[in-house]
Amino acid sequence: NIDVCKLGTVTVQPAPVIPLGSAANISCSLNPKQGCSHYPSSNELILLKFVNDVLVENLHGKKVHDHTGHSSTFQVTNLSLGMTLFVCKLNCSNSQKKPPVPVCGVEISVGVAPEPPQNISCVQEGENGTVACSWNSGKVTYLKTNYTLQLSGPNNLTCQKQCFSDNRQNCNRLDLGINLSPDLAESRFIVRVTAINDLGNSSSLPHTFTFLDIVIPLPPWDIRINFLNASGSRGTLQWEDEGQVVLNQLRYQPLNSTSWNMVNATNAKGKYDLRDLRPFTEYEFQISSKLHLSGGSWSNWSESLRTRTPEEEPVGILDIWYMKQDIDYDRQQISLFWKSLNPSEARGKILHYQVTLQEVTKKTTLQNTTRHTSWTRVIPRTGAWTASVSAANSKGASAPTHINIVDLCGTGLLAPHQVSAKSENMDNILVTWQPPKKADSAVREYIVEWRALQPGSITKFPPHWLRIPPDNMSALISENIKPYICYEIRVHALSESQGGCSSIRGDSKHKAPVSGPHITAITEKKERLFISWTHIPFPEQRGCILHYRIYWKERDSTAQPELCEIQYRRSQNSHPISSLQPRVTYVLWMTAVTAAGESPQGNEREFCPQGKAN
């Protein structure tokens, strides 16, 4: 309601725009014949201060001059940066009920003079782009400030553009809309930025540049790669560039990599041969351009080209292991297992494996292909057998890996000594051993093999193994090692035609078993009691069971029970005890012990021996 100012006027001295820290005088004057009717002497002019449309102060006490009933002058100080609104109102004191009436208002802007613009930088994107410059405006002025960008160059070239900053928009960049062409490559250009507002003006230092200083080539486009003869390691990278480009930078990396391969190419003319690519690998390629060998700026990187290199035939050798078991009086079952090639060896999608089993002397050969990483066959128990496996992709096959089929644990003299297994942490076990003492042939390698002591399918749950050089006497096994599971670990010493092995049990973490063995029967034979039990279910063992304990005491006795400790063997499920008195009723139970402690007791059975027991 102050836009019309019908009742009077408001003026500001020295001006409605003042520097920070200055004072201003605001005069409010009523127009002739305006004011409180009948009682001109009762006219009271008041000045209200608003910030962001919120009343913050009544400046009643800041009057410095008063013509009663006609005009008042107020002094305002300590105004904050930005815009402050002052509204003059008329208060007719004889009327208690009517609110003050707005007379007029004024906005005072407090700010600072602009600082000289600094850090001018100009770019022209591409040969056909236009020159755009940006700068640092310095401190905020809090006032509308105009900026003028002026460019001058050879042949009386001049050009200028303007923009302004206020509380809604910032002006620190202008596009001049002119294009500098390569024929001006050696010419010098000068730009200057001038800033002006109501409190002053300032000018930047002149900034001088050449065409090469500011032109940034457009990033290369239409990137593609052509693999020579479908090679997986050699390809020609091609792209489109602006005509004046003389230098390119190429970077490429496998998609899962963290470091780029970098290449500089001079006068590439949109083509470059790469020779060190990895077959069957997803790559990302990017290119940047420059217009001059020494000066000028690199373009932004191009958009990425993502593509997979073609396959090449597999390299490397498969890691083969086997298991053999006699399945009748003259036949044995050979189960071959092998580990998948790693991607850098497979160099493509492995389609199948070629498996050969050959009897050396009779030249009997069994051949097959499989997509699995195991293969099983029944063969005669006689003869010397050798196996080989190779991996095939669409481009070819790897060299076959051969292994002699020997009786893996057949030679006691080749058995490694002092095998131990120590848990290192939750998911690995350190296995150590000493070499065979009296091996009559040299150890070619050790194989450390492990299987969970849980029921499993021979083919569905293949063994895990590590090949160890003959001068190493330890292995850290971690593949498929889970806590609270007991593993049987074999260390094989292999010579050319023989094998010896030693076994040990180990776990990576253990707890006391959940329960004790369940006593199923107590029988009396020849003055001895035989305790029979069923083993603790595998999930309840919680590690390697070291031994079982059989406890007994007379029924109703409060004495400590007697006990017999027996070494755990999975194949054993009964044990004799012989120190019970005849015709005395006993209570018996069993527990199991791991390295972490003893289980709760299993079921209790009562028994009263009949015969004489010593």
């Epitope: 029921p455 499993g456 399918s457 083919t459």
Partner: nanobody
């Protein structure tokens, strides 16, 4: 424990066919490798055929091409289809399951079913 029960044996003429069945019950969660054996009078028990978890099969040379081993996991059953039977195929046929615990192989056997091939 695992229990195996064979059925399907009988007396047939040479050149005819029989289909043997074996059904497993009990703790069969780890039994994937199933075998057929046979024992002729006065001879040692011999391997006839097996089938693995991945349905890979292998046969005794003398029955290869005539016998086919198969399985139905939903029914916990394994079968031996015997075609073009010969008098020398006469034997008690046994179903066998093998599982491995550590490096020890546990074997389970059925009671056997008699197959007699007359000429």
């Amino acid at each position: 424990q695992v229990q195996l029960q064979e059925s399907g044996g009988g007396l047939v003429q040479a050149g005819e066919s029989l289909r043997l069945s074996c059904t497993a019950s009990g703790s069969i969660f780890a039994i994937d490798d199933m075998y057929w054996y046979r024992q002729a009078p006065g001879k040692q028990r011999e391997f006839v055929a097996y089938i693995t978890a991945t349905n890979s099969a292998n046969y005794l040379d003398s029955v290869n091409g005539r016998f086919t081993i198969s399985r139905d996991n939903a029914k916990n059953s394994v079968y031996l289809q015997m075609n073009s039977l010969k008098p020398e195929d006469t034997a008690v046929y046994y179903c066998n399951a093998k599982q491995i615990v550590g490096f020890q192989i546990d074997e389970y056997w059925g009671q056997g079913t008699q197959v007699t091939v007359s000429s």
